[in-house]
Amino acid sequence: VLEVYYTSLRCRCVQESSVFIPRRFIDRIQILPRGNGCPRKEIIVWKKNKSIVCVDPQAEWIQRMMEVLRKRSSSTLPVPVFKRKIP
């Protein structure tokens, strides 16, 4: 559900939303840390209706959700955190 990508690409998000999305409608969350061509952290949410949205990293709900997912991934198997480096 939670994925962290380190990329050398430019920013992926043109605009960001802060509108809440319930977790049951989320397939996965992709986190792109700032740096390497993009000056800001980006969060991309892949939804179960196959649409994709960039979420404002400052939105309280996404911070809360990522914290919950991190806690679950450290204590249980079903919610892995993937880290992948792309040169």
């Epitope: 509108v19 977790r23 409608f25 939804k47 179960k48």
Partner: antibody
């Protein structure tokens, strides 16, 4: 008092169309995700579709994708379900329900009284 | 898709009995489970959400527990008005209801 009132049910032939409405009062409609749930006669409950606050995001169970469309009009405090290419297996009581506010504690909390849709020739 | 297996499908009990209904999920649903009561011709009524939080106005004889894939609804002392059908609902990934448990008077 929270109220959800469905209308638009009835008898329709296979392949036909029907539009259900759900009139809402007693809470700030635009603050909630909304859902449609159905129940075939004598059977269990089945989630049909959900829609986000402004109608820009919709979700459907696989068996109704491409046939049903959920929509809303926040100015009219109304939720809709357009049902096309109806099949006998769509026969059910259709309920609208509040689905989600920000903190998640209102999931499927308030329900309407239901609208019966019968698909038969 | 997550499947919910509810058991038993029907249950006969007497007033004052303690009753337990179980729902098993096909995968971990992280306590995102709701229980409903439904009477004939009526809409479902929410009893418990997030596994164990009692809905306002619901008597304390109803309780919920569980984690991972297994969840239970317990009625500690059945009252005449409790004879109805009960459903569980997982809301971890989209929505799936259990098949229902019809609670009848013995």
């Amino acid at each position: 008092e929270v109220q959800l009132v469905e209308s638009g049910g009835g008898l329709v032939q296979p392949g036909g169309s029907l539009r259900l409405s759900c009139a809402v009062s007693g809470f700030t409609f635009s603050d909630y995700y909304m859902a449609w749930v159905r129940q075939a006669p004598g059977k269990g409950l089945e989630w049909v579709a959900s829609i986000n606050y402004d109608g820009g995001d919709t979700y459907y169970r696989d068996s109704v994708k491409g046939r049903f469309t959920v929509s809303r009009d926040n100015a009219k405090n109304s939720l809709y379900l357009q049902m096309n290419s109806l099949r006998a297996e769509d026969t059910a009581v259709y309920y609208c329900a509040t689905e989600e506010d920000y903190d998640g504690s209102y999931v499927m909390d308030a329900w309407g009284q239901g609208a019966l849709v019968t698909v038969s020739s | 898709d997550i499947q919910m297996t509810q058991s038993p499908s029907s249950l006969s009990a007497s007033v004052g009995d303690r009753v337990t209904i179980t729902c098993k999920a096909s995968q971990n649903i992280n306590k995102e489970l709701t229980w409903y009561q439904q009477k004939p011709g009526k809409a479902p009524k929410r009893l418990i959400y997030n596994t164990n939080i009692l809905q306002t106005g619901i008597p304390s004889r109803f309780s919920g527990s569980g984690s991972g894939t297994e969840y239970t609804l317990t009625i500690s002392s059945l009252q005449p008005e409790d004879f109805a059908t009960y459903f569980c609902l997982q809301q971890s990934s989209l929505y799936t209801f259990g098949q229902g448990t019809k609670l009848e008077i013995k």
